[in-house]
């Protein structure tokens, strides 16, 4: 008799793939543009990335550091009207893209939460949650919560409002903190909160340290659903050298939880490469004309257009990983087991019941390495086969689909491998 199938866990929409942050509409759309109507025209692009949710804004009225002139119910006219927003919501829904609205109140000011008028601001947020839930948004984000006094209790209250409306609504909180204890204290009183932080930002680009950070986090958070990113708002290139971008994409898409990216992460957008562009929100490079300030500054391989035409590009890798993440049971909600693979490497298995299983091996170092996969670290339910098929490598040159002997696995500098193998009873 065949073994009984394991019962599938309840899956919320944010469990099924990545979230994509567009914090600055104008930078995302390019000079001379930057409104909700224009964003509607970019939804097909978001669909092509197979992201499940768009984290938008803030887009509300906010006069810097002025509580009275901050209205969380009103869209800043520079971004468009409530009608434009409704139209965007409708279009996004048709494309199965959920919309999460950032309600960080004083987003243009010195302190995101107007440090002196916490209760007034908290009431404004409460009213805004109810208003925008009625308008049809799928969730909310609030950032810089380390600046919000009594953050845990406010988050619990906002979570109740959000979940009270529908279990299918999401609340994301963002913090600049990278301290695990601070992060855990924010999480412990808020069961379903998705928290983005700087926890992984000091992973130091070594396999051992990254492995230790990831496993500590997963052990500390237990069975709760995690999110994975390097910060609450910034681009991956703010933290990583270019040669590690592919590796981190592979890792973020295959860890158990929701990967969260900022616009431009999929093409390796780097503000530091573009004079005059701010770290917070550089202009999105749709094509070579997106940065007209210095003729010739942008080459085709830096742009969406150029990378879309190149199957070996970072964008193509992002699309493939996003696709795998959203359709493979083991990646959607599978168990996670990290194990030793040798110095400089981070490796783990994702598996769910009798479904296809995935092995991830990441070489963070700048020298080629032989992987010594220590299968003895793994439980019996997650044992390794002698061979696994190469689904993809972050480096060009490997023959995809070919079986690789796991005992003889060699990785190039900064290479990540995603391998698949079948369940064996």
């Amino acid at each position: 008799r065949a073994p009984r199938c394991r019962e599938l866990p309840a899956q919320k929409w944010w469990h099924t793939g990545a979230l994509y942050r567009i914090g600055d509409l104008q930078a995302f759309q390019g000079h001379g543009a930057g409104n909700l109507a224009g964003l509607k025209g970019r939804l097909d692009y978001l669909s092509s990335l197979k992201v499940k949710g768009l984290v938008l804004g803030p887009i509300h009225k906010n006069q810097k550091d002025d509580v009275a002139q901050t209205d969380l119910l009103q869209i800043d006219p520079n971004f468009g009207s409530k009608e434009d927003f409704d139209s965007l919501l409708q279009s996004a829904k048709k494309k199965s893209i959920r919309v999460i609205l950032d309600l960080t109140p004083n987003y243009r000011g010195e302190n995101s939460w107007f440090s002196t008028q916490v209760d007034t601001v908290a009431t404004k947020v409460k009213d805004a949650l109810e208003f925008w839930l009625q308008a049809g948004v799928d969730g909310f984000q609030v950032r810089d919560i380390e600046n919000l006094k009594d953050a845990s209790s406010f988050l619990a209250e906002w979570q109740n409002i959000t979940k009270g409306f529908s279990e299918d609504r999401l609340l994301i909180a963002g913090t600049n903190s990278s301290d695990l204890q601070q992060i855990l204290s924010l999480l412990e009183s808020n069961k379903d909160l998705l928290l983005t932080s700087s926890y992984l930002s000091d992973s130091g680009s070594t396999g051992e340290h990254t492995k230790s950070l990831v496993t500590q986090y997963l052990n500390a958070t237990g069975n709760r659903w995690c999110s994975w990113s390097l910060s609450q708002a910034r681009l991956l290139t703010s933290f990583l050298p270019a040669q590690l971008l592919r590796l981190y994409q592979l890792m973020l898409f295959t860890l158990p939880g929701t990967p969260v990216f900022s616009y431009g992460d999929e093409i390796g957008l780097d503000a530091a490469a573009l004079p005059g562009q701010p770290m917070e929100a550089p202009v999105m490079l749709w094509d070579e004309s997106s940065f007209p300030d210095i003729p010739g500054a942008v080459s085709a391989n830096m742009t969406v257009k150029g990378q879309s035409e190149d199957p070996g590009s970072l964008l193509s890798l992002f699309r493939r990983l996003s696709d795998q993440r959203s359709k493979e049971r083991s990646l959607l909600h599978g168990d996670f087991h990290a194990f030793s693979a040798g110095p400089g490497l981070f490796s783990y298995i994702r598996h769910w019941d009798q479904n296809e299983r995935f092995l991830v091996v990441l070489n963070f170092g700048d020298v080629g390495l032989s992987a010594g996969l220590q299968a003895s670290d793994l439980p019996a339910s997650a044992s390794l086969p002698a061979k696994a098929d190469l689904l993809l490598s972050t480096q060009p040159g490997r023959e995809e689909g070919s079986p690789l002997e796991l005992e003889r696995l060699k990785l190039e500098p900064h290479e990540g491998l995603l391998l698949r193998f079948p369940y064996a009873a």
């Epitope: 104008q26 703010s238 770290m279 917070e280």
Partner: antibody
Amino acid sequence: QVQLVQSGAEVKKPGASVKVSCKASGYTFTSYWMHWVRQAPGQGLEWIGNINPNGGKTNYNERFKNRATMTRDTSTSTVYMELSSLRSEDTAVYFCTREIDWGQGTLVTVSS
Amino acid sequence: EIVLTQSPATLSLSPGERATLACSVSSSVNYIHWVQQKPGQAPRLWIYSTSKLASGVPARFSGSGSGTDFTLTISSLEPEDFAVYYCQQRSSYPYTFGQGTKLEIK
């Protein structure tokens, strides 16, 4: 073409404040952050901070955080940098820059 | 903050010679920029994104490097090249400059 035109030289007493202006033309003012950089006599360049003309968000170098204030007036495409509690070490040429283009500089002399 | 250290502080060379200016960064960055400044003038963006020449910069200039070590090279010095060159990082706040290398005529 792009021009950043700064206000004229200033002489101030220690403890006073100074407000330097930078009028931009030749590009869309709200599309580019403006930075302030200073250079003491015979010294190198020091970044003070930046401002997003679209909304007024600012970042400051910690060294100047409590003394520098950057503002903007979108109606005149002008950014301002005010430095308070001046001391003799603040004697310098202050530049506004869009990074691609620089203003001509404003000499601020602090002397009793 | 990220500290940039330039060497040498002063480089004395004759026109026609090759100049190599170094910039060492205290922690790894993806790109640096170089600005040129002549006496009594505002600085000018000279090389950006490590190796790209700003508008109007002659092809005898080149930039290279990655991580923590970057170089500006002038293949054959012309009289107008003598100036102070600063490297700058804009990968994290606060943006910082090196202390400058003064390129002077020997």
